[in-house]
């Protein structure tokens, strides 16, 4: 199987934005990549998001995909926004070299992304 | 039912150009790459062409390099092979088909015949 | 080019038959290995991926082994319908090739 590395931890940020680094070994010349985020919690693993792209050109997210990202010779940064507390949990990226053949797959031990609902503004007296 | 209909097959003298189609239904078009494979009278089956499921990989086999070209139109599920410059060794029946990993062809066009003749 | 040697190119078995049919692929190919069976005058079917994955509605009497180079598509009993010839091919490498066919006959 591919080695694919990513961080153990990432805080989002205060306005539900986490991004990190997905970097895989590529045993091949690939010229068609696949990168999925996968959200493991409670034992459950859910599809956050999946690209497709060609090696040097960018990641093509569905419109309505929580997720963004570039890509950098075996390098994929992620960003994923909109995340609420109760997103908090172990996200996955899991890699396909599709084109040309052979097929290889390569998944992630996962990162931990820690989400913090802001505090509301507390009342003005001024 | 996953279906896959060829059209655009018919004689054509040495040199000539034809253009293949290949209707699809049944799938979800656009998740899945596809495939022409050719079978001459008689013969074995010949790998022609393959395009991946956003036509971001195109490959061919090395005798078709330069003279085939495959596409497609996810918009209208169709498949496409323009032949340039035919020869008389292009005469076969040529499917269409899906192509899901592990790289094997898992549904086939009942084929569209191309007969190359002066 | 990955070339495929199928044998034997043809053969001619009973009903009730155990039938083998052997691929040779000339360098290392893992797993990618599929079986296609085309009956006369009809449209190629995939039978078998992954050496020995069977592909959905495929009988049970159908399996395949092999590794690395040397393949088998074994029918445990023939049927009247299986008369047919049947193709090996590798995806591990492009160009996708096929076997020469194996045609299979009944006594």
């Known amino acids: 199987a591919m080695h694919v590395a990513q961080p153990a931890v990432v805080l989002a940020s205060s306005r539900g934005i986490a991004s990190f680094v997905c970097e895989y070994a590529s045993p091949g010349k690939a010229t068609e990549v696949r990168v999925t985020v996968l959200r493991q919690a409670d034992s459950q693993v859910t599809e956050v998001c999946a690209a497709t792209y060609m090696m040097g050109n960018e990641l093509t997210f569905l419109d309505d995909s929580i997720c963004t990202g570039t890509s950098s010779g075996n390098q994929v940064n992620l960003t994923i926004q909109g995340l609420r507390a109760m997103d908090t949990g172990l996200y996955i990226c899991k890699v396909e070299l599709m084109y040309p053949p052979p097929y290889y797959l390569g998944i992630g031990n996962g990162t931990q992304i820690y989400v913090i609902d802001p505090e509301p503004c507390p009342d003005s007296d001024f | 039912e996953v279906q896959l209909v060829e059209s655009g097959g018919g004689l054509v003298k040495p040199g000539g150009s034809l253009r293949l189609s290949c209707a699809a239904s049944?799938?979800?078009?656009?998740?899945?790459?596809m495939a022409w494979v050719r079978q001459a009278p008689g013969k074995g089956l010949e790998w022609v062409a393959f395009?991946?499921?956003?036509?971001?990989?195109?490959y061919y086999a090395d005798t078709e390099t330069g003279r085939f070209t495959i596409s497609r139109d996810n918009a209208k599920n169709s498949l496409y092979l323009q032949m340039n410059s035919l020869r008389a060794e292009d005469t076969a029946v040529y499917y269409c088909?899906?192509?899901?990993?592990?790289?094997?062809?898992?549904?086939w066009g009942q084929g569209t015949t191309v007969t190359v003749s002066s | 080019d990955i070339q495929m040697t199928q044998s034997p190119s043809s053969l001619s078995a009973s009903v009730g038959d155990r039938v083998t049919i052997t691929c040779r692929a000339s360098?290392?190919?893992?797993?990618?290995l599929n079986w296609y069976q085309q009956k006369p005058g009809k449209v190629p079917k995939l039978l078998i991926y992954?050496?020995?994955r069977l592909h959905s509605g495929v009988p049970s009497r159908f399996s395949g082994s092999g590794s690395g180079t040397d393949f088998t598509l074994t029918i445990s009993s023939l049927q009247p319908e299986d008369v047919a010839t049947y193709y090996c091919?590798?995806?591990?490498?492009?160009?996708?090739?096929f076997g020469g066919g194996t045609k299979v006959e009944i006594k």
């Open positions: 088909a899906r192509s899901g990993l592990p790289y094997a062809m898992d549904y």
């Open positions: 091919q590798q995806g591990r490498m492009l160009p996708w090739t």
């Open positions: 049944g799938f979800t078009f656009s998740d899945y790459g």
């Open positions: 360098q290392d190919i893992s797993n990618y």
């Open positions: 395009i991946s499921n956003l036509a971001y990989s195109v």
């Open positions: 992954y050496i020995s």
